[in-house]
């Protein structure tokens, strides 16, 4: 089931998606699409990165975080009710049947009537707390570094905290990384 994220009409919406590059700048293609992740690629692509850069985007959709460090979280600018729905973040790891697929549900609420606009929170790369875990099957001879890592199964359980947290840069500053797979 999809993790749900909320935003108000006129605000920017934030949909988190992360991976760990094998080395700085050693990027993996990522696509974002409107609609649930299909068997291959993304449907209705709104943004795409390649091994070097963002190579396709549409208006109002951008990456606010540092995608060169694996933060490929999507920001949708000035949302309307029509932006509600499922979005797919697909991390396109080379080889067959390796892609990591994340379906995220965006719910847009009508804007509250407020006396003055408030500044949109900065959600650049925040996980307010993380349990780190290693161990993915048997010990292996081929690993690239021994970074602390976070099992992605934990992400969905922390999604609500992520949305409401103001601790934006603690995780990045700690050097922790998220482990895919």
């Amino acid at each position: 089931s999809e993790v749900e994220y909320r935003a108000e009409v006129g605000q920017n919406a934030y949909l988190p998606c992360f991976y760990t590059p094998a080395a700085p700048g050693n990027l993996v293609p990522v696509c974002w699409g409107k609609g649930a992740c299909p068997v291959f690629e993304c449907g209705n692509v709104v943004l795409r990165t390649d091994e070097r850069d963002v190579n396709y985007w549409t208006s109002r959709y951008w990456l606010n975080g540092d995608f060169r460090k694996g933060d490929v979280s999507l920001t949708i600018e000035n949302v309307t009710l029509a932006d509600s729905g499922i979005y797919c973040c697909r991390i396109q790891i080379p080889g067959i049947m390796n892609d990591e697929k994340f379906n995220l549900k965006l719910v847009i609420k009508p804007a509250k009537v407020t006396p003055a606009p408030t500044r949109q929170r900065d959600f650049t790369a925040a996980f307010p707390r993380m349990l780190t875990t290693r161990g993915h099957g048997p010990a292996e001879t081929q690993t690239l570094g021994s970074l602390p890592d976070i099992n992605l199964t934990q992400i969905s359980t922390l999604a609500n905290e992520l949305r409401d947290s103001r601790l934006a840069n603690d995780l990045r500053d700690s050097g922790a990384t998220i482990r895919i797979g």
Epitope: G95, N98, H136, G181
Partner: antibody, heavy 124, light 106 residues
Framework: EVQLQQSGAELARPGASVKLSCKAS????????MQWVKQRPGQGLEWIGA????????RYTQNFKGKATLTADKSSSTAYMQLSSLASEDSAVYYC?????????????????WGQGTTLTVSS | DVQMIQSPKSMSMSVGERVTLSCKAS??????VSWYQQKPDQSPKLLIY???NRYTGVPDRFTGSGSATDFTLTISSVQAEDLADYHC????????FGSGTKLEMK
């Protein structure tokens, strides 16, 4: 300890269908692809298809589309393969195998645990 | 589909000899090649993945090498328990396997 326990040998008539099972234990069933592989006597291995129980994603090789149907029951951590319209050339040992996929950091892509195999004999 | 061609079909060796098995892919598969050992009446077992990485618990007499289209499995000093069929497989695209090499003892 990871284990894949397959159902027992099957004898079937031409034209019939059979459903083979593979019960997984010792790991999180929904987090790994389950693959199915065919081996005819004295021959090599032939990949049939795979299912990802976590989201129900299924892949088939062209040769087995319409022949094999893969399903998975998350509650019992069991994968199934139904083979239909059986013919003598479907006589083989069928293996289920867990797939360890690559991450952005480590290249894997291999079959790391295999079931003991189910022997299917198709004969009139 | 990517074709994987193994050679030889079979070979007869004496204990202590060096064995080299070959596997050629019909197109570039990078290093997405694994080697599996299958003893008589048993399931296959993973030996090598990523063309050259020895799987957990595999004796160091087994070594994999190669990339792109040409791959080799070497057994530096063959033992009686190595009597088996050896299969190479690629997993860059949907998995395909070679037809196997049968290793027999003289």
């Amino acid at each position: 300890e990871v284990q894949l326990q397959q159902s027992g040998a099957e004898l079937a008539r031409p034209g019939a269908s059979v459903k083979l099972s593979c019960k997984a234990s010792g790991y999180t069933f929904t987090s790994y692809w389950m693959q199915w592989v065919k081996q005819r006597p004295g021959q090599g291995l032939e990949w049939i298809g795979a299912i990802y129980p976590g989201d129900g994603d299924i892949r088939y090789t062209q040769n087995f589309k319409g022949k094999a149907t893969l399903t998975a029951d998350k509650s019992s951590s069991t994968a199934y393969m139904q083979l239909s319209s059986l013919a003598s050339e479907d006589s083989a040992v069928y293996y289920c195998a867990r797939w360890e996929k690559s991450t952005t950091v480590v290249q894997r892509n291999y079959f790391d645990y295999w079931g003991q195999g189910t022997t299917l004999t198709v004969s009139s | 589909d990517v074709q994987m061609i193994q050679s030889p079909k079979s070979m007869s060796m004496s204990v202590g000899e060096r064995v080299t098995l070959s596997c050629k892919a019909s197109e570039n598969v990078g290093t997405f090649v694994s080697w599996y050992q299958q003893k008589p009446d048993q399931s296959p077992k993973l030996l090598i993945y990523g063309a050259s990485n020895r799987y957990t618990g595999v004796p160091d007499r087994f070594t994999g090498s190669g990339s792109a289209t040409d791959f080799t499995l070497t057994i530096s000093s063959v033992q009686a328990e190595d009597l088996a069929d050896y299969h190479c497989g690629q997993s860059y695209s949907y998995p395909t396997f070679g037809s196997g090499t049968k290793l027999e003892m003289k």
